[in-house]
Amino acid sequence: LQDLCSNCPAGTFCDNNRSQICSPCPPNSFSSAGGQRTCDICRQCKGVFKTRKECSSTSNAECDCISGYHCLGAECSMCEQDCKQGQELTKKGCKDCCFGTFNDQKRGICRPWTNCSLDGKSVLVNGTKERDVVCGPSPADLSPGASSATPPAPAREPGHSPQ
């Protein structure tokens, strides 16, 4: 029986109870390798999951998360609640980022603002809950009388009127 079963391809199972030894997988089941004694039940994308790829006779269904959630795990084994930018998910739900931290995505944790002074630079744009600080040139790089807040206007090409 072993030799006969190994001839059954993916999408079938080795049916000991039937004269035709390889039987197609029943609806809502699959076998992704040959020689299986039974077909596996298809994954059902229910609740916070939605179907990304339907189950076929040779491959399991693949799930995504419904709107307001995002996948965790390589094959979306879990769905985690989205938060707003400027927030992170805690055990008690979505919480605003603490001062000095930011999150520019709907998932993940709040991360500290960049410390511009570590690179010898100054803060050009202050950070917010949603955005990191923007570092500018160090004070020593600025020529006397130059302003760190407004970069010089680009020179216009001849023949072009202002927009």
Epitope: A10, S32, G34, Q36, G73
Partner: nanobody, 123 residues
């Protein structure tokens, strides 16, 4: 990255019992079929049994049927092999393995499995 870390092997008397564990990390454990194989010195790697992604269907080699049981705890990302009524011929290095998402080989063929544990000696 994908990792399978085994534990629980050792020395056991004939007729005794042993449980092997295989802890998975780096991937969605509950979306893949898993299997146990063994390899005795000088022999080819031998299929022991396989468990579906959701534990819904199992397949055992005749040599271990009724004595060995495979189970899985998906929330803990762990596969188990419970071995009872052990015999001297069960002496081998035991491996857990993750089934590929698709294979043209049979379910009992080593080529159908893409990631393997480091192996556990059972004597």
């Amino acid at each position: 990255q994908v990792q399978l870390v085994q534990s629980g092997g050792g020395l056991v008397q004939p007729g005794g019992s042993l449980r092997l564990s295989c802890a998975a990390s780096g991937w969605a454990f509950d979306n893949y079929g898993m299997a146990w194989f063994r390899q005795a010195p000088g022999k080819e790697r031998e299929f022991i049994g396989r468990l579906a992604w959701n534990g819904g269907s199992t397949d055992y080699a005749d040599s271990v049927k009724g004595r060995f049981t495979i189970s899985r705890d998906n929330p803990k990302n762990t596969l188990y092999l419970q071995m009872n009524s052990l015999k001297p011929e069960d002496t081998a290095v035991y491996y857990c393995a993750r089934q590929r998402s698709y294979s043209r080989y049979g379910i009992r063929a080593p080529q159908t499995y893409d990631y393997w544990g480091q192996g556990t000696q059972v004597t």
